[in-house]
Interface confidence: medium
């Protein structure tokens, strides 16, 4: 996902709607003017703001990366929603890119969870039911895995 936080823009353009701030803040879909007197609407499809704010600029809309699909477009009050393509996932703790899901579990393990846009397949030991740890196993342990994505043993 590519995004720049504040989007410098030509303010006071004729087509941009203006309203007055409430308690010094502007509503979602707007940013505040430099003199603090006006709320200026964000530009649909270009930038947005999600909450009451005193932002000098609206936030620039995210553009989905290749390998992502756009679930919903950017509006003036909501950023673009991007999701990993089928067969790939993005973890909470590594949100920078979509990674390929593994195609199978290590030997001695069974699949209990499918690949989703936010998680890899889930493998557990046949006997104990212990989840895999994400450590890279010895090559001979691997049953099937995506190229470049070793299967993981359990903890």
């Amino acid at each position: 996902i590519t995004q720049q936080d504040l989007a410098p823009q030509q303010r006071a353009a004729p087509q941009q709607k203006r309203s007055s701030p409430s308690e010094g803040l502007c509503p979602p879909g707007h940013h505040i003017s430099e003199d603090g007197r006006d709320c200026i609407s964000c530009k649909y499809g270009q930038d947005y703001s999600t909450h009451w704010n005193d932002l000098l600029f609206c936030l620039r809309c995210t553009r989905c990366d290749s390998g992502e699909v756009e679930l919903s477009p950017c509006t003036t009050t909501r950023n673009t929603v991007c999701q990993c393509e089928e067969g790939t996932f993005r973890e909470e703790d590594s949100p920078e890119m979509c990674r390929k899901c593994r195609t199978g579990c290590p030997r001695g393990m069974v699949k209990v969870g499918d690949c989703t846009p936010w998680s890899d397949i889930e493998c557990v030991h046949k006997e104990s039911g212990t989840k895999h740890s994400g450590e890279v196993p010895a090559v001979e342990e691997t049953v099937t895995s995506s190229p470049g994505t070793p299967a993981s043993p359990c903890s």
């Epitope: 936080d5 504040l6 932002l55 600029f57 949100p95």
Partner: nanobody, 125 residues
């Protein structure tokens, strides 16, 4: 690694004020979005306010608009939350957060990479 230490919580009567502080160490905060979330007993963690970056502007949840003010002192690597006209429903543990990257605006917990331990604010008479 970033460490965040909140302070300033406590017991206050309805209508009273508190000022929370969050001291960051391990990274300069000046180019990063920071913010405050809170979690009341038995409820989901919710967004309170965010400072986008380098004093570029601030975000506020509807529930605190006009009562809470977020600010930051980049020279002290510290984020503040001035809370006025406190209500019983503001009772919660307040968490300071820092964004994953300079480009991340924090308005959802997903955008926050570093969390403080939290400071308890109790509003009661």
């Amino acid at each position: 690694e970033v460490q965040l230490l909140e302070s300033g919580g406590g017991l206050v009567q309805p209508g009273g004020s508190l000022r929370l502080s969050c001291a960051a160490s391990g990274r300069s905060i000046s180019n990063y979005a920071m913010g405050w979330f809170r979690q009341a007993p038995g409820k989901e963690r919710e967004f309170v306010s965010a400072s986008v970056w380098n004093n570029g502007g601030n975000y506020y949840a509807d529930s605190v608009k006009g009562r809470f003010t977020i600010s930051r002192d980049n020279s002290k690597n510290t984020l503040y939350l001035q809370m006025n006209s406190l209500r019983a429903e503001d009772t919660a543990v307040y968490y300071c957060v820092v964004a994953r990257t300079p480009e991340t605006p924090i308005t959802s917990a997903r955008g926050a990479n570093y969390w403080g331990q939290g400071t308890l604010v109790t509003v009661s008479s």
